[in-house]
Interface confidence: medium
């Protein structure tokens, strides 16, 4: 049998059974998550679960820009440094940039400082680009 690769929505890119949408619009973290959800298919702000996934995403985004941070689906809802993925994925792979995670910074972004391969925490009300993900 021929195994067909599932198709993503127009403009979204496919990698390892997932579709990703890079939104070059300014949204705070919660509005970004709501916009991801509005696309259905169980879409959320993206979870990044391996270095391979991180590298693919980073390469794609670098084709557009190299200076703006991007919201991902990692947050600290209890504000106790207990980070979790909004889509329910296991928080095993970690790629923090090593910066201080104190203060009122309870949402995670892909940092442009290391070509989007590492994450930083930031204030959730900041308006930034964002990355959505769903499984087709």
């Amino acid at each position: 049998d021929i195994i067909m690769r599932p198709s993503c929505a127009p403009g979204w890119f496919y990698h390892k059974s997932n579709c990703y949408g890079y939104f070059r619009k300014l949204r705070n973290w919660s509005d970004a998550e709501l916009e991801c959800q509005s696309y259905g298919n169980g879409a959320h702000l993206a979870s990044i679960l391996s270095l391979k996934e991180a590298s693919t995403i980073a390469e794609y985004i670098s084709g557009y820009q190299r200076s703006q941070p991007i919201w991902i689906g990692l947050h600290d809802p209890q504000k106790r440094q207990q980070w979790q993925w909004i889509d329910g994925a296991m928080y095993l792979y970690r790629s923090w940039s090593g910066k201080s995670m104190g203060g009122n910074k309870h949402c995670a972004e892909m940092s442009s400082n290391n070509n989007f391969l590492t994450w930083s925490s930031n204030e959730c009300n900041k308006r930034q680009h964002f990355l959505c993900k769903y499984r087709p």
């Epitope: 403009g11 949408g21 939104f23 070059r24 619009k25 557009y64 200076s67 703006q68 308006r127």
Partner: antibody, heavy 127, light 109 residues
Amino acid sequence: EVQLLESGGGLVQPGGSLRLSCAASGFTFSSYAMSWVRQAPGKGLEWVSAISGSGGSTYYADSVKGRFTISRDNSKNTLYLQMNSLRAEDTAVYYCARHYQSGGYVYITFYYPMDVWGQGTLVTVSS
Amino acid sequence: FMLTQPHSVSESPGKTVTLSCTRSSGSISFDYVQWYQQRPGSSPILVIFEDDQRPSGVPDRFSGSIDSTSNSASLTISGLQSEDEGDYYCQTYDDNRQVFGGGTKLTVL
């Protein structure tokens, strides 16, 4: 009052050069990215080039890359477009435009909308 | 990619008109869309930015929206007035460039 005033247009032969200027007033010029947009007679708008507030980043449409150079002198509140190797298809009204900035967010130059436009200057390339 | 707009649209005063702008490839939702009005003999004016935001001074008769299903943006003008006549351009951006639609000529009958 926020104002942009272009000058330097005129008639030039194919292969010739021209430098357009855009004098800005009424705002802190160095804080804003700027663009040149052109409009051929009876045609639509075509973005030509953009420059960041500091002048450190510049961007060009493929149609003018290597022939046109955008620059700015923040001490004189003036934007420039140096146009070399001009062609008949460069004939157009050239507008300078300011890029709007919201909330002090340091954002990519060309992503901002253009909220203030000059009155335009006509460049005619013909022999 | 390209932004495609209808060449011309006509409507009577007081009516509502919707101008469309369709993106040929890539998602219309990924990048902000702006709309510019250009009255005859004048410079362009920004009437909608960031998909649906109105600059101060632009009447609330002007509204913008995005439809990811049709991959298009729309500019709706209600209570059409004679001074609304002119060309309307949608605009978005791509990797290091601004992209304009071809423009729609709006005639108020």
